[in-house]
């Protein structure tokens, strides 16, 4: 008995060939011997089966002795043994229809779980193997689960269903809703304007939801909301903004926030959360702000940084075009009785300068100038 695998919703063509290459009488029946279709001369006739409106044949092939049964919009319950009767012969074809669907929506938030469920006919024992867009293979039976979806899981998942040494392939497009970056860090000198950007890693026709930037300043004992906003069809409207700092927010995507001035009291880390319409759960992006200040008080030249710096970062004070006078893995460095000239405060990571602030030290009889 020939086995044919079909996909739910697809069209399948079951073949039936006579030895004579001409149009002769044929019938297709199901396992209950109910006629599906056949011919009467050059006319197609249909029986009382449930397939009535979805069954067809190809009249153009009859003259060549081919009498296919075409079933459109396949359903799992179409799985059956189909019998073609032609020239006193019976050809049996076993059709097995499978369906593979994603648990809920194919648009899932980063960190959520994807469950793929296989619909299969009774009595079948298929195996399923799926390959994610990043090449990860998962195997299973009736259900396959992937927990903690990542951005790289966005794309086409290819799943192969194996039954009776035959296979059928399913392709499911999955969109992982996430920010492009999980975390970002902004380095600024005191007084500079700060720009925070939160680009999304997906595009949808209409984007509606709401969000908040929650901030933990390094110098504050508790965290607080800096801004709350709504998003309607990709248009941003501010709901509430704290009075200090007075953030500004762009009206269009990508989500964009402006802090008028980088000040030590704002240095710290924030979490932008975005809730999307019809989704339970939220998208998150961490953002960090490091602020540098260089000052001269009496005979002491000081450079300080505030905010989340890694222990391997180096803070240095040097006179322009000279070797560093002081260089430490600390958040504050100073030089006593600095020479006159342009001093540079540098925050660097393995030699790469992340942040630089210049301060002019004048001869001792005058006051310092900050460029």
């Amino acid at each position: 008995k020939k086995v044919v695998l079909g996909k739910k919703g697809d069209t399948v063509e079951l073949t039936c060939t006579a030895s004579q290459k001409k149009s002769i009488q044929f019938h297709w029946k199901n396992s209950n011997q109910i006629k599906i279709l056949g011919n009467q001369g050059s006319f197609l006739t249909k029986g009382p089966s449930k397939l009535n409106d979805r069954a067809d044949s190809r009249r153009s092939l009859w003259d060549q002795g081919n009498f296919p049964l075409i079933i459109k919009n396949l359903k799992i319950e179409d799985s059956d043994t189909y019998i073609c009767e032609v020239e006193d012969q019976k050809e049996e074809v076993q059709l097995l229809v499978f369906g593979l669907t994603a648990n809920s929506d194919t648009h899932l938030l980063q960190g959520q779980s994807l469950t793929l469920t296989l619909e299969s006919p009774p009595g079948s024992s298929p195996s399923v193997q799926c390959r994610s867009p990043r090449g990860k293979n998962i195997q299973g039976g009736k259900t396959l689960s992937v927990s903690q979806l990542e951005l790289q899981d966005s794309g086409t998942w290819t799943c192969t269903v194996l039954q009776n040494q035959k296979k059928v392939e399913f392709k499911i497009d999955i969109v992982v809703l996430a920010f492009q970056k999980a975390s970002s860090i902004v380095y600024k000198k005191e007084g500079e304007q700060v720009e925070f950007s939160f680009p999304l890693a997906f595009t949808v026709e209409k984007l509606t939801g709401s969000g908040e930037l929650w901030w933990q300043a390094e110098r504050a004992s508790s965290s607080k909301s800096w801004i709350t906003f709504d998003l309607k069809n990709k248009e941003v409207s501010v709901k509430r903004v704290t009075q200090d700092p007075k953030l500004q927010m762009g009206k269009k995507l990508p989500l964009h926030l402006t802090l008028p001035q980088a000040l030590p009291q704002y240095a710290g880390s924030g979490n932008l959360t975005l809730a999307l319409e019809a989704k339970t759960g939220k998208l998150h992006q961490e953002v960090n702000l490091v602020v540098m200040r260089a000052t001269q008080l009496q005979k002491n030249l000081t450079c300080e940084v505030w905010g989340p710096t890694s222990p391997k970062l180096m803070l240095s004070l040097k006179l322009e075009n000279k070797e560093a006078k002081v260089s430490k893995r600390e958040k504050a460095v100073w030089v006593l009785n600095p020479e006159a000239g342009m001093w540079q405060c540098l925050l660097s990571d393995s030699g790469q300068v992340l942040l630089e602030s210049n301060i002019k030290v004048l001869p001792t009889w005058s006051t310092p100038v900050q460029p």
């Epitope: 939801g209 709401s210 508790s222 607080k224 909301s225 509430r240 200090d244 339970t280 759960g281 939220k282």
Partner: antibody, heavy 119, light 107 residues
């Protein structure tokens, strides 16, 4: 530790006035919006009014507009609710609450002050 | 004003039961929804903010879901200390409004 303590509740005749106070401690009071929420005996919660950090923005539920006034004194870390033209239906426990939670939630509440309007 | 409708108004349950309370807003409120627990003679306590985020210090048996107009608070395995009244509250637009409350009682 964040603490909110209401005071000034009591028995007042219909048409009378009362001023509720809420003393805040354990946080930077001037950085937060504050709310008043009330609960009539045996009933549910009803949001009454709120005020922004510097007192320039105020919002009220329709049923108290023109009779109840929310205000604050950041120098004294205090929130107030001035209640005039009181009615029997204003009888309730009045809670002051901090709008310091994420997504505009009320994260800290006082223990409440009972206001009874009766002749 | 946005009306918040909670159901059921009361529920009798046993320790270990799974309990779900629903809250429906008369118009879309995105995720501007919080859930509070109140015990007799006490002030309300925040459980869930932003429709689905668990407040720090709240046991993980509490969870929130939904967005737009339909929201659910679920207690996965009811504990003796969970017998209380629960309120949903919208913070989408003024005046802020609460649901009428759902009393969770011992069966």
């Amino acid at each position: 530790e964040v603490q909110l303590v209401e005071s000034g509740g009591g028995l007042v005749q219909p048409g009378g006035s009362l001023r509720l106070s809420c003393a805040a401690s354990g946080f930077t009071f001037s950085s937060y919006w504050m709310s008043w929420v009330r609960q009539a005996p045996g009933k549910g919660l009803e949001w009454v009014a709120n005020i922004n950090e510097d007192g320039n923005e105020k919002y009220y539920v329709d049923s108290v507009k023109g009779r109840l006034t929310i205000s604050r004194d950041n120098a004294k870390n205090s929130l107030y609710l001035q209640m005039n033209s009181l009615r029997a239906e204003d009888t309730a426990v009045y809670f002051c609450a901090r709008e310091g939670g994420q997504w505009l939630s009320l994260d800290y509440w006082g223990q409440g002050a009972l206001v009874t309007v009766s002749s | 004003d946005i009306q918040m409708t909670q159901s059921p108004s009361s529920v009798s349950a046993s320790v270990g039961d799974r309990v779900s309370i629903t809250c429906r807003a008369s118009q879309g409120i995105s995720s501007w929804l919080a859930w509070y627990q109140q015990k007799p003679g006490k002030a309300p306590k925040i459980l869930i903010y932003g429709a689905s985020s668990l407040q720090s210090g709240v046991p993980s048996r509490f969870s929130g879901s939904g967005s737009g107009t339909d929201f659910t608070l679920t207690i996965s395995s009811l504990q003796p200390e969970d017998f209380a009244t629960y309120y949903c509250q919208q913070a989408n637009s003024f005046p802020w409004t609460f649901g009428q409350g759902t009393k969770v009682e011992i069966k």
